[in-house]
């Protein structure tokens, strides 16, 4: 008995005068803009994106919108074409989303918020933006109240007039409308396709954020990696900075080259590398092989526990007022416009601590 | 270039044993489950047993569970298959493969025929 | 386990043809199904994997599809080279299961 090390776990809320707001990673669910899609990134990655077929020709579809089909078959006319150098991750810098765009509104406990308060982030849903990152030597913005108020609230446009025409299924064309949420602490990076929440166009999203501190203890009394991270990408240890330390050192091994979201310095896979092996790899590794990415708890971390409610926007009675004020038609409001409101809902936080039973 | 060379294969008495053995060469062999899969003469494919990376986790089909055993030694970059109790109907074709989002490579296949 | 139901078993046709083959999951397998290609006396040979993606250097009049439970192998114009056995294989889950192969010879 006296070597089993038993540990019990206490839980404490703990009273705050301000509290740092955590990070806020959004993706639009569009990889790309239609619009933003040159021939030669048709050339490319047309049959990656399911657009083109082997033979360089738009597969024959019953399923396409004529004036989208009408500047595809323009573009897909390749005669005399001299296919340029091509890079994946400048393609989805460039056809991403831009956040001034997407961007209709944005306030921080009150005061206006703007595009260049976020920063640009590459995952697996491509471009995407985090607000409050607490890089490039901005400070981590703190809150001093709990309530709506209190914390961050957008409006965004999810521009569906964008989204590219789905006539296949593939990992980089998207079934849905909206965008994904990543709330994180500052010290990780976002891991937003596995742990995003999704957002829907048509409604305000309430997000009613806990902070928790959670502290486990090490071996022999529980599990969790008290070193530091043992990475050339990453600073601090985390299991999402451990798990794409990983999924890059798979993709790596298995494909020769990396992701555009992912680290180091290996080439950037091709769209060729990206259909043939990147995608179905990674899907492999994340869905299949339980043993590749074994990542310990670490010692110390923050999470946000949540709570989210919606309310429909807009209204029948603001949805004329809202087209007017954004130039675009009823419809289109109904169809692109999001409100995102994220705050704590209390000025406290939660600690959830292990503790040696005995010493 | 990723190559998986089998070995160990051969004539056998009823109810005896064989171990069969995979050489791995061009790949991280530890970070790869590994599988073994058989093809009795004028049959199709039969997939027998599978092990984790590590070797912590062993799995293997019902026609052979009890009598043989998968292991693997990665220092040595070697698959196993510790075949006991062996009967008529073990005799085939036998593969190792390497599991991942494809099964690439096939070893070459080993014969291992089973007479009373 | 999951059982794989391939069909047909046997299938007759001529250069040039299209044809294909089915193959049935008891239970979803998610994308996660491998054809392969068989001829007398040697190793399978990898076309497809994850359904639909095609193994470097094989033709591509080789093509895959389907999803869960239902997939097909199809062969847009049969090649002389083409005459062969054909098998699905699932690796969702242990035990992983193969079809009981497809015999594809000259009508």
């Known amino acids: 008995y006296y070597f089993c090390y038993h540990h019990v776990t206490k839980l404490d809320e703990v009273a705050a005068s301000q509290l740092t707001f955590p990070a806020v990673t959004l993706c639009n669910l569009n990889e790309f803009r239609f619009s933003q899609v040159s021939k030669n990134d048709l050339y490319h990655a047309g049959e990656l994106l399911a657009l083109l077929n082997n033979r360089y020709e738009i597969p024959d579809t019953q399923m396409a919108d004529e004036k989208q089909l009408e500047i595809l078959q323009d573009k897909a006319n390749f005669r005399s074409f001299k296919p340029k150098p091509f890079n994946m991750r400048e393609f989805y810098d460039r056809a991403g989303h831009d956040i001034r765009d997407m961007l209709l509104s944005c306030h921080f406990r009150g005061e206006a918020c703007s595009a260049e308060d976020f920063k640009v982030v590459f995952t697996r849903y491509g471009k995407c933006y985090t607000f409050n990152s607490g890089q490039d030597g901005r400070p981590r913005l703190k809150t001093m109240k709990g309530g709506t108020g209190n914390g961050l609230e957008i409006m965004l446009d999810i521009q569906q007039d964008e989204y590219l025409p789905v006539w296949g299924e593939t990992d980089e064309t998207s079934f849905e409308a909206g965008i994904k949420v990543q709330i994180h602490s500052q010290d990780e990076p976002p891991f937003i396709d596995q742990l995003g929440f999704g957002v829907a166009p048509g409604f305000q999203t309430f997000v009613s954020c806990q902070e928790q501190r959670l502290i486990y203890l090490p071996s022999p009394w529980g599990t969790c990696n008290a070193v530091t991270m043992d990475s050339d990408f990453f600073d601090s240890y985390s299991i999402t900075a451990c798990r794409i330390d990983c999924e890059t050192r798979y993709l790596v091994e298995n494909c020769n080259c990396r992701m555009v979201h992912m680290p180091g310095d290996a080439p950037y896979c091709t769209p060729e590398q990206y259909k043939e092996c990147a995608d179905p790899a990674l899907d492999f590794l994340v869905e299949k092989d339980q043993e590749y990415c074994v990542c310990e708890m670490p010692c110390n971390l923050t999470r946000y526990g949540k709570e989210l409610s919606m309310v429909k926007i807009p209204s029948k009675a603001s949805a004329k007022y809202l087209a007017k004020k954004f130039n675009k038609s009823e419809q289109y409001i109904g169809e692109n416009i999001l409100v995102l409101d994220i705050f704590f809902e209390v000025l406290n936080y939660e600690t959830i601590e292990q503790k040696k039973a005995y010493e | 270039e990723v190559q998986l060379l089998a070995s160990g294969g051969g004539l056998v008495q009823t109810g005896g044993s064989l171990r069969l053995s995979c050489a791995a060469s061009?790949?991280?062999?530890?970070?790869?489950?590994m599988s073994w899969v058989r093809q009795a003469p004028g049959k199709g494919l039969e997939w027998v047993s599978g092990?984790?990376?590590?070797?912590?986790?062993?799995y293997y089909a019902d026609s052979v569970k009890g009598r043989f055993t998968i292991s693997r030694d990665n220092s040595k970059n070697t698959l196993y298959l510790q075949m006991n109790s062996l009967r008529a109907e073990d005799t085939a074709a036998y593969y190792c493969?390497?599991?991942?989002?494809?099964?690439?490579?096939w070893g070459q296949g080993i014969r291992v025929t089973v007479s009373s | 386990d999951i059982q794989m139901t391939q069909s047909p078993s046997t299938l007759s046709a001529s250069v040039g043809d299209r044809v294909t083959i089915t193959c049935r999951a008891s239970q979803s397998i998610s994308s996660w199904l491998a054809w392969y290609q068989q001829k007398p006396g040697k190793a399978p040979n990898l076309l497809i994997y994850?359904?639909?993606n095609l193994e470097s250097g094989v033709p591509s009049r080789f093509s895959g599809s389907g999803s869960g439970t239902e997939f097909t192998l199809t062969i847009s114009s049969l090649q002389p080279d083409d005459f062969a056995t054909y098998y699905c294989q699932q690796y969702n889950s242990y035990s992983y299961t193969f079809g009981q192969g497809t015999k594809l010879e000259i009508k």
């Open positions: 493969a390497k599991e991942a989002y494809k099964w690439q490579p």
């Open positions: 061009g790949f991280t062999f530890s970070s790869f489950a």
């Open positions: 092990i984790s990376g590590s070797g912590g986790s062993t």
């Open positions: 994850k359904t639909s």
